[in-house]
C-alpha cells in the first residue's frame, strides 16, 4: 500500500526521533552543568548544542531568563526551570491539541505530527477529504473537522461499506400512496392515478380533476369522474369538432335537390291550417267561379281551396280525403259532402278545375269531369250593390269543425299554373316570387323532409291499458325510423317531459363516441344523458336506413338495418335507466320528431335538429305530421326532395 508523501514522512519521523533519545538526555545534563549552575557564554552554549540553529534559538531566550529571574548564582528556582525548558520546543506544546498526535522537538524547532484528517504546521487545519474523488463516496461526501463521512440522497440508503448507496423501495410500505398506485423510482417513488385523476398527498388518494375549470371546452363542459365531455349548441347548428373540445357547424354531407320552383305555390306552409293565399273578389257584374290549376301531392288529406262567403252563408270547399277529391258545400245553410274520382295523391302533376255553371258545379281532373253537383244559388253574393267572393287556397277562413264534415286542413301539396276567374293573377305570382317559403321543391318523393331547423311533436301515451292482454309489460316504446339523412348529427325521435324539462328518451345521429372520445358515425339510444346503446351507420351514403328501437320492462334494443347495436351499460345500469324512463312515462311526455325544444345541451347526447328524409312509426302506428300537435313550417309532411344526382 502506498501512502502520500506527507503521511509517509509523518510515519517515519517518530522512529527517527527515538534514535536520538539517548543523545538528547546527555545534552540535557551537559546544559545543566554549563548554563544552569554556571553562567555560560554563546560559545559555551554552542558546545552544548553542537549546532548553530539550536544555539541561535536558545541563547537570546537564555538571556531573557537571566533578565527575568537573575543570574544562576542567585539560585532562583524559577531560573533553572526557565532555562531547562528552552531547548524542548514542544514545551509548552505549540501544536493544536485536537489535530495533533504528537509534538516532536527539533533543533530550535518542533514538528507537529497530525492525526488523520488534520494538517498544517500546528495540525490545526482540517483536511477536506471530499475535495479529492468525493472522498470515495458514491453520492454525498460530508467533510468535518478531522474526518468525513458518506451519505446518500433522499430515497437511497448507505451500504455497509459506508461509501456506496442503494435505492430504497418506498413502495414496500403499503401506506406510501394510500389508495393510489405506487411506482418505485431511483431515489424516489411516484403515486399514480388513472387519467383524469390527480394524487392528493394530504388525503393519500386519487381525486378527480375538474377539467372544466381549465376551460377546455369551447361551449358547455360537463365534468365526470376521471373525464369530462364538451357539448355544443346543437339547436344552434353546432357539433363537436375532431378535437372533441371545440365546436363546428353541422354541414350537410349529402346534397338534396332542394331547388324550388318560383312558379309554384306550396300549400303546406301554414301548420295552423290557415290559408296560404286569401283572395277577395268583388264585382259590379254578377260573376261565376272558375278556378283551374295544376296540382301535385303525396298527402292523402287536406284542403285545396275554399270559395264563397262567410261560414253560415254559401260556400264550397275542395279537399282531399283518402287521396280522392272531396267537395263540401253549403248553400243557404244546407250542407253536403260529395267524394268521387280517382286517387290523385300519387305525386304527379294533374290539372284540376272547378267551374260554377248556371245551376251546377263541375269538378274536373285532367279535363275529365269527376263530379257534377246541382246547386241552388250563386257563390258570388250581393252586398250593397257589389258581388263578393272570398277564395282561399290551402285552408279555410274558419275553423275546420264548422265544415259539413271535419277534415284535417293541412295539405302538403303544390300548385302551379293557377287561374282564378279567368283573370291573370299577378298578385300571387309576385308574392310567391319573392317568398321562397311559398314555393315548392321542384322535385319531390314520398316521405317527410326535415330541413334541420325545427321539429314536430305529438301527445302520445306509452302506458299500456289493462285491456291490452297478452303482455305483462305496463309500458312500451317501439320506434321504426326510415331515414335518408342529409347531415351526420341530429335527433330522430325523442320524448320530452315538460314538467321536469328532461329528455327521458332520445334516438339520434351522432358523429362521435363520447366516452371513447372517438369520431365515428353512430346512432345513439339514450335515456336522459346516458347512452344505452350505440350502432354504427353509414349516414352520408345517400341511402335509406332503417333504425329500430324497442324498449320495455327489462330490455332495450337498437338496430340499424337489421344489425343490433352495442350495449353501453351494464345490466344493472340498464335496469336503473329503464326505471327512470318508466317514471317519466307515468307523467305527461311529448313525443318529438326531428329535434328537441330549448333544453340544456347536457339533457341528451344530441340536441341538434335532424336534416333529411324520415318517416316514423311509433308503437306500430305511422306518425302523420299533419296530425302533430305542432310542426315547424319548414318541415314538409308528405314530400321529400331527392338526393342530388352525382355530377358526371
Amino acid at each position: 500500500a502506498l501512502l502520500p508523501a506527507r503521511e509517509a514522512t509523518q510515519f517515519l519521523r517518530p522512529r527517527q526521533r527515538r534514535a536520538f533519545q539517548v543523545f538528547e538526555e546527555a545534552k540535557q545534563g551537559h546544559l545543566e552543568r554549563e548554563c544552569v549552575e554556571e553562567l555560560c557564554s554563546r560559545e559555551e552554549a554552542r558546545e552544548v548544542f553542537e549546532n548553530d540553529p539550536e544555539t541561535d534559538y536558545f541563547y537570546p531566550r537564555y538571556l531573557d531568563c537571566i533578565n527575568k529571574y537573575g543570574s544562576p548564582y542567585t539560585k532562583n528556582s524559577g531560573f533553572a526551570t526557565c532555562v531547562q525548558n528552552l531547548p524542548d520546543q514542544c514545551t509548552p506544546n505549540p501544536c493544536d491539541r485536537k489535530g495533533t498526535q504528537a509534538c516532536q522537538d527539533l533543533m530550535g524547532n518542533f514538528f507537529c505530527l497530525c492525526k488523520a484528517g488534520w494538517g498544517g504546521r500546528l495540525c490545526d487545519k482540517d483536511v477536506n477529504e471530499c475535495s479529492q474523488e468525493n472522498g470515495g463516496c458514491l453520492q454525498i461526501c460530508h467533510n468535518k473537522p478531522g474526518s468525513f463521512h458518506c451519505s446518500c440522497h433522499s430515497g437511497f440508503e448507505l451500504s455497509s461499506d459506508g461509501r456506496t448507496c442503494q435505492d430504497i423501495d418506498e413502495c414496500a410500505d403499503s401506506e406510501a400512496c394510500g389508495e393510489a398506485r405506487c411506482k418505485n423510482l431511483p431515489g424516489s417513488y411516484s403515486c399514480l392515478c388513472d387519467e383524469g385523476f390527480a394524487y392528493s398527498s394530504q388525503e393519500k388518494a386519487c381525486r378527480d380533476v375538474d377539467e372544466c375549470l381549465q376551460g377546455r371546452c369551447e361551449q358547455v363542459c360537463v365534468n365526470s369522474p376521471g373525464s369530462y365531455t364538451c357539448h355544443c349548441d346543437g339547436r344552434g347548428g353546432l357539433k363537436l369538432s375532431q378535437d372533441m373540445d371545440t365546436c363546428e357547424d353541422i354541414l350537410p354531407c349529402v346534397p338534396f335537390s332542394v331547388a324550388k320552383s318560383v312558379k309554384s305555390l306550396y300549400l303546406g306552409r301554414m301548420f295552423s291550417g290557415t290559408p296560404v293565399i286569401r283572395l277577395r273578389f268583388k264585382r259590379l257584374q254578377p260573376t261565376r267561379l272558375v278556378a283551374e290549376f295544376d296540382f301535385r301531392t303525396f298527402d292523402p288529406e287536406g284542403i285545396l281551396l275554399f270559395a264563397g262567403g262567410h261560414q253560415d252563408s254559401t260556400w264550397i270547399v275542395l279537399a282531399l280525403r283518402a287521396g280522392r277529391l272531396e267537395l263540401q258545400l253549403r248553400y243557404n245553410g244546407v250542407g253536403r259532402v260529395t267524394s268521387s274520382g280517382p286517387v290523385i295523391n300519387h305525386g304527379m302533376w294533374q290539372t284540376i278545375s272547378v267551374e260554377e255553371l248556371a245551376r251546377n258545379l263541375v269538378i274536373k281532373v285532367n279535363r275529365d269531369a269527376v263530379m257534377k253537383i246541382a246547386v241552388a244559388g250563386d257563390l258570388f253574393q250581393p252586398e250593397r250593390g257589389l258581388y263578393h267572393l272570398n277564395l282561399t287556397v290551402g285552408g279555410i277562413p274558419f275553423h275546420e269543425k264548422d265544415l259539413v264534415q271535419p277534415i284535417n286542413p293541412r295539405l302538403d301539396g303544390c300548385m302551379r299554373s293557377w287561374n282564378w276567374l279567368n283573370g291573370e293573377d299577378t298578385t300571387i305570382q309576385e308574392t310567391v316570387k319573392v317568398n321562397t317559403r311559398m314555393q315548392c321543391f321542384s322535385v319531390t318523393e314520398r316521405g317527410s323532409f326535415y330541413p334541420g331547423s325545427g321539429f314536430a311533436f305529438y301527445s302520445l301515451d306509452y302506458m299500456r291499458t289493462p285491456l291490452d292482454v297478452g303482455t305483462e309489460s305496463t309500458w312500451e316504446v317501439e320506434v321504426v325510423a326510415h331515414i335518408r339523412p342529409a347531415a351526420d348529427t341530429g335527433v330522430l325521435f325523442a320524448l320530452w317531459a315538460p314538467d321536469l324539462r328532461a329528455v327521458p328518451l332520445s334516438v339520434a345521429l351522432v358523429d362521435y363516441h363520447s366516452t371513447k372520445k372517438l369520431k365515428k358515425q353512430l346512432v345513439v339510444l339514450a335515456v336522459e344523458h346516458t347512452a344505452l346503446a350505440l350502432m354504427e351507420i353509414k349516414v352520408c351514403d345517400g341511402q335509406e336506413h332503417v333504425v329500430t328501437v324497442s324498449l320495455r320492462d327489462g330490455e332495450a334494443t337498437l338496430e340499424v338495418d337489421g344489425t343490433r347495436g352495442q350495449s353501453e351499460v351494464s345490466a344493472a345500469q340498464l335496469q336503473e335507466r329503464l326505471a327512470v324512463l318508466e317514471r317519466h312515462l307515468r307523467s305527461p311526455v311529448l313525443t318529438f320528431a326531428g329535434g328537441l325544444p330549448d333544453v340544456p345541451v347536457t339533457s341528451a347526447p344530441v340536441t341538434a335538429f335532424y336534416r333529411g328524409c324520415m318517416t316514423l312509426e311509433v308503437n306500430r302506428r305511422l306518425l302523420d305530421l299533419d296530425e302533430a300537435a305542432y310542426k315547424h313550417s319548414d318541415i314538409t309532411a308528405h314530400s321529400c326532395p331527392p338526393v342530388e344526382p352525382a355530377a358526371a
Partner: antibody
Framework: QVHLVQSGPELKKPGASVKISCKAS????????MNWVKQAPGQGLKWMGW????????TYTEEFKGRFVFSLDTSVTTSYLQISTLKAEDTATYFC?????????WGQGTLVTVSS | ETTLTQSPSSLSVSTGDRVTITCITS??????MNWYQQKPGKPPKLLIS???TLRPGVPSRFSSSGSGTDFTLTISSTQPEDFADYYC?????????FGQGTKVEIK
C-alpha cells in the same frame, strides 16, 4: 296582357253630341263589367257608373242620369260612352276602367272639350 | 251614398320626407279602401287595394292603414317620382266614391 285603348280627343260645341270608345283586349270581354270615370280639368275623379258586358245593362249614378249613355259592341270587345246636348261643364277627360270591384286596368283617357 | 273627405288638399315636401294623407268616410266601410296615384296626362294607378294590400310592383315605401271610417296612406321617404296627385276610393257600396284628392308638390 290586359289593354284598354280609348278613342282620341274631341272638340265639340255646346249642344252637340259625342261618342267615345274603349277597346278591350287581353281578356274575356264579357267576364268583366266596364266602368266610366270623369275628371274635369284640375279636378278630382268621379265614378259615372258601369255597364254589364254580359247583358248590356247600364247603371248610372244620379249625377250622370239623362244625357249619358253606356253601350257595347261585344263583337269588337268595345264599350262606348255617348254624351248628348254637351255643356261647358262636360269638358273633362273620360276614362274607362275594367270592373274588379275596384279599378286596376284603365284606358289612357279621352279629353272632350266643349267650347263655342 | 258614402262620402269621402280627403286631407290635406295639397302639401309641399322635400325628397326623403315622410308623407301622410288621410281619408275619412261618412259610413263604416270595413277595410274596403283603395289608394291611387295620378300623374299629369295619365290614368290613375292603383297603389293599394282593399284590405291594405300593396299591389304588385308598388314600392314598399307606400303603405296604408285603417278600417271603419279612418284611413291613412303613408309614403315613408318621398322620392322624386312620388310627386303626384293621390286619391282614395271606397268600394264597400254603390255608388263607388272618390276622395277630392291630395296634391303632393316639391317644396
Amino acid at each position: 296582357q290586359v289593354h284598354l285603348v280609348q278613342s282620341g280627343p274631341e272638340l265639340k260645341k255646346p249642344g252637340a253630341s259625342v261618342k267615345i270608345s274603349c277597346k278591350a283586349s287581353g281578356y274575356t270581354f264579357t267576364n268583366y263589367g266596364m266602368n266610366w270615370v270623369k275628371q274635369a280639368p284640375g279636378q278630382g275623379l268621379k265614378w259615372m257608373g258601369w255597364i254589364n258586358t254580359n247583358t248590356g245593362e247600364p247603371t248610372y249614378t244620379e249625377e250622370f242620369k239623362g244625357r249619358f249613355v253606356f253601350s257595347l259592341d261585344t263583337s269588337v270587345t268595345t264599350s262606348y260612352l255617348q254624351i248628348s246636348t254637351l255643356k261647358a261643364e262636360d269638358t273633362a277627360t273620360y276614362f274607362c276602367a275594367r270592373d274588379e270591384g275596384w279599378f286596376v286596368y284603365w284606358g289612357q283617357g279621352t279629353l272632350v272639350t266643349v267650347s263655342s | 251614398e258614402t262620402t269621402l273627405t280627403q286631407s290635406p288638399s295639397s302639401l309641399s315636401v322635400s325628397t326623403g320626407d315622410r308623407v301622410t294623407i288621410t281619408c275619412i268616410t261618412s259610413t263604416d266601410i270595413d277595410d274596403d279602401m283603395n289608394w291611387y296615384q295620378q300623374k299629369p296626362g295619365k290614368p290613375p294607378k292603383l297603389l293599394i287595394s282593399e284590405g291594405n294590400t300593396l299591389r304588385p310592383g308598388v314600392p314598399s315605401r307606400f303603405s296604408s292603414s285603417g278600417s271603419g271610417t279612418d284611413f291613412t296612406l303613408t309614403i315613408s321617404s318621398t322620392q322624386p317620382e312620388d310627386f303626384a296627385d293621390y286619391y282614395c276610393l271606397q268600394t264597400d257600396s254603390v255608388p263607388l266614391t272618390f276622395g277630392q284628392g291630395t296634391k303632393v308638390e316639391i317644396k
